[in-house]
């Protein structure tokens, strides 16, 4: 019994003066609380509490359920206790079959004994199954058996409290352990699409998937920089124990331009938080933006190939595409494909393959594309570079020598005189007249240049060379002169 120094209030005394008492079932329990300032007796077992204001607690016919802790309290709040076991061969355990444990924490299997003198007080698996190898427990006859550091793997474990009574193993009612998981990671969140592009009035719907070990995970859709509560719908599934999935679907039935922005799906548990965002862009009407992948002015050499390539953004998706040249539509030689297979792709590529281009095939090539809202086009000006071709080279009646050449870019014509029979004509002759003949004609195709020199300047036999050249190449024509007396005679020109 407790003792304290004189002058200080002391705890009550209990008779019988023992910490534990064993009573046979059917016998009387008689407990006396000795204290001038007696207040009450309390009885506790398995979360059940009873009170008695008499200083003597009497139970005439004790039952197993009278097993428990009897506490006497005085007016100073000081108390003393005695634990009474009511031995009942037919009821060795008092049980509260609720059994919940938090992962990594201890939990109590509440099966206190009614007889402290039994042996082998322990846990057993149901139907003779062994307990998990790593399951550790600590028995306490007055409280039950504590399972140490509960594991997730113990969820729905069926077990009994067990004890040996007079050489026989006795089992309690069964317990089913329910384990509440510890959150050991942030929720896993994902979104159905990272971005959405819509026209005004269309429905916006986006789904966030949240995965965690328990349904006790918080999730919400938030509009960035806004406190407005968004309307969302949930679906959830348990794919197994500790494998929970929630789908939170956010819907705006008729999107407006000012609904554009970033939407965040946020989830958190006791470990931490995670989020994922999706971007909504609402446009008042569809659009097409075309981006040439090469310069829209194209120079290509005669006989070579060129690819005219455009990328374009189209929303809604493109319905008609075509390439046109000189009012003629190409039926082949071109391809059109999405830039990516992503379902939110709005970028496309179109390629026109021009092969072995002739000088006559320069001109404007136009790409046209349309969707349900708009049309758009882009033009490429294709110039075919051709080596000069000398169209005519003549001696005119007025004594002029004239050379006419065509090519692209515009040819330059130079004149040279070779005295005698020399083949190398180095002495240049200045032309009297140079004209570009078709400068005001069609913008594409070959340019024609005419150049003339005065042949009267030549006093000796020899050859005159007309050389037409541009970036692509050069071509020459020759005039041969022979003097007979004072007469100058032109021999037929040759190239």
């Amino acid at each position: 019994q407790p003792s304290v120094s004189p002058g200080e209030p002391s705890p009550p005394s209990i008779h019988p003066a023992k910490s534990e008492l064993i009573v046979r079932v059917g016998n009387e329990i008689r407990l006396l609380c000795i204290d001038p300032g007696f207040v009450k007796w309390t009885f506790e077992i398995l979360d059940e509490t009873n009170e008695n204001k008499q200083n003597e607690w009497i139970t005439e016919k004790a039952e197993a359920t009278n097993t428990g802790k009897y506490t006497c309290t005085n007016k100073h709040g000081l108390s003393s206790s005695i634990y009474v076991f009511v031995r009942d061969p037919a009821k060795l355990f008092l049980v509260d079959r609720s059994l919940y444990g938090k992962e990594d924490n201890d939990t109590l299997v509440r099966c206190p004994l009614t007889d402290p003198e039994v042996t082998s007080y322990s846990l057993k698996g149901c139907q003779g199954k062994p307990l998990p190898k790593d399951l550790r427990f600590v028995p306490d006859p007055k409280a039950g058996i504590t399972i140490k550091s509960v594991k997730r793997a113990y969820h729905r474990l069926c077990l009994h409290c067990s004890a040996d009574q007079e050489g026989k193993s006795v089992l309690s009612d069964k317990f089913i352990l329910k384990v509440r998981p510890a959150f050991k990671a942030v929720p896993v969140v994902s979104v159905s699409k990272a971005s959405y592009l819509l026209r005004e009035g269309e429905e916006f719907t986006v789904t966030c998937t949240i995965k965690d070990v328990s349904s006790s995970v918080y999730s919400t859709w938030k509009r960035e920089n806004s406190q407005t509560k968004l309307q969302e719908k949930y679906n959830s599934w348990h794919h197994g124990d500790f494998n929970y999935e929630r789908q939170a679907t956010l819907t705006i039935s008729s999107a407006r331009v000012n609904d554009s922005g970033v939407f965040m799906c946020y989830a958190n548990n006791t470990f931490g938080s995670a989020n994922v965002t999706t971007t909504l862009e609402v446009v008042d009407k569809g659009f097409i933006n075309i981006f040439p992948m090469i310069n829209t002015t194209v120079f290509v050499n005669d006989g070579e190939n060129v690819d005219l390539i455009v990328e374009y953004e189209a929303f809604p998706k493109p319905e008609h595409q075509q390439w046109i040249y000189m009012n003629r539509t190409f039926t082949d030689k071109w391809e059109d494909y999405p830039k990516s297979e992503n379902e939110s792709n709005i970028r496309y590529v179109s390629e026109l393959h021009l092969t072995r281009l002739k000088g006559t095939e320069g001109g404007t090539y136009t790409f046209l594309v349309s969707n349900s809202d708009v049309n758009a086009s882009i033009a490429f000006n294709v110039y075919v570079n051709t080596k000069p071709e000398i169209l005519t080279y003549d001696r005119l009646v007025n004594g002029m020598l004239q050379c006419v050449a065509a090519g692209f870019p515009e040819p330059t014509i130079d004149w040279y005189f070779c005295p005698g029979t020399e083949q190398r004509c180095s002495a240049s002759v200045l032309p009297v007249d140079v004209q570009t003949l078709n400068a005001s004609g069609p913008p594409f195709g070959k340019l024609v240049v005419q150049s003339s020199i005065d042949s009267s300047a030549f006093k000796h036999n020899g050859t005159v060379e007309c050389k037409a050249y541009n970036d692509v190449g050069k071509t020459s024509a020759y005039f041969n002169f022979a003097f007979k007396g004072n007469n100058k005679e032109q021999i037929h020109p040759h190239t």
């Epitope: 609720s98 919940y100 509440r180 006790s216 995970v217 348990h238």
Partner: antibody
Framework: QVQLVQSGAEVKKPGSSVKVSCKAS????????ISWVRQAPGQGLEWMGG????????NYAQKFQGRVTITADESTSTAYMELSSLRSEDTAVYYC????????????WGRGTLVTVSS | DIQMTQSPSSLSASVGDRVTITCRAS??????LNWYQQKPGKAPKLLIY???SLQSGVPSRFSGSGSGTDFTLTISSLQPEDFATYYC????????FGGGTKVEIK
């Protein structure tokens, strides 16, 4: 043994709210799942939502989302269900039950609270 | 939501009869299926959890079977106290109950 003790019957006007309590006597209340299930006269059972007090977060059936609020007070081992914007079709017996979240079965039920909605 | 369809909705039987009630889920619910008994004016009582596990204190004449979408509750020999309404309930998605099967005295 653990019991779930519910508050008494209520008569409410349409448009008003009702708050029903459910006190658990004993056990590891904080780790229980406490759900609310209702039963209209002569009808079947309908889960409204539930909470695990330790985690503090309620889950609700889609039908009741935004109209029901389930809370729990660990210090008093009491769960609450508040239903707002009441209409006549909300007249039912409202049961609290242990279980209903994270695949828990309903292994313990309260006696039920009759809520009558009438003008 | 997962729909739970119970059949029959009612049946008449005599004491000692073997009674079978079926419950079909609109999609797979693995073994997350529970059976309850309810008597008039009383709260439901758990009979079977996880499709086939007998709840403590429930007589062994009650048994459950099935997995995936099809489940059965069997009462091997009907007793007078078994006349009641029986409900199945799934726990995979938002909880839903079957419509109930009323077992009446023939």
């Amino acid at each position: 043994q653990v019991q779930l003790v519910q508050s008494g019957a209520e008569v409410k006007k349409p448009g008003s709210s009702v708050k029903v309590s459910c006190k658990a006597s004993g056990g590891t209340f904080s780790l229980y799942a406490i759900s609310w299930v209702r039963q209209a006269p002569g009808q079947g059972l309908e889960w409204m939502g539930g909470i695990i007090p330790h985690f503090g977060l309620a889950n609700y059936a889609q039908k009741f989302q935004g109209r029901v609020t389930i809370t729990a007070d660990e210090s008093t081992s009491t769960a609450y269900m508040e239903l707002s914007s009441l209409r006549s079709e909300d007249t039912a017996v409202y049961y609290c039950a242990r279980g209903g979240l994270d695949t828990d079965e309903f292994d313990l039920w309260g006696r039920g609270t009759l809520v009558t909605v009438s003008s | 939501d997962i729909q739970m369809t119970q059949s029959p909705s009612s049946l008449s039987a005599s004491v000692g009869d073997r009674v079978t009630i079926t419950c079909r889920a609109s999609q797979s619910i693995n073994s997350y299926l529970n059976w309850y008994q309810q008597k008039p004016g009383k709260a439901p009582k758990l009979l079977i959890y996880a499709a086939s596990s007998l709840q403590s204190g429930v007589p062994s004449r009650f048994s459950g079977s099935g997995s995936g979408t099809d489940f059965t509750l069997t009462i091997s020999s009907l007793q007078p106290e078994d006349f009641a309404t029986y409900y199945c309930q799934q726990g995979v998605s938002d909880i839903t109950f079957g419509g109930g099967t009323k077992v009446e005295i023939k």
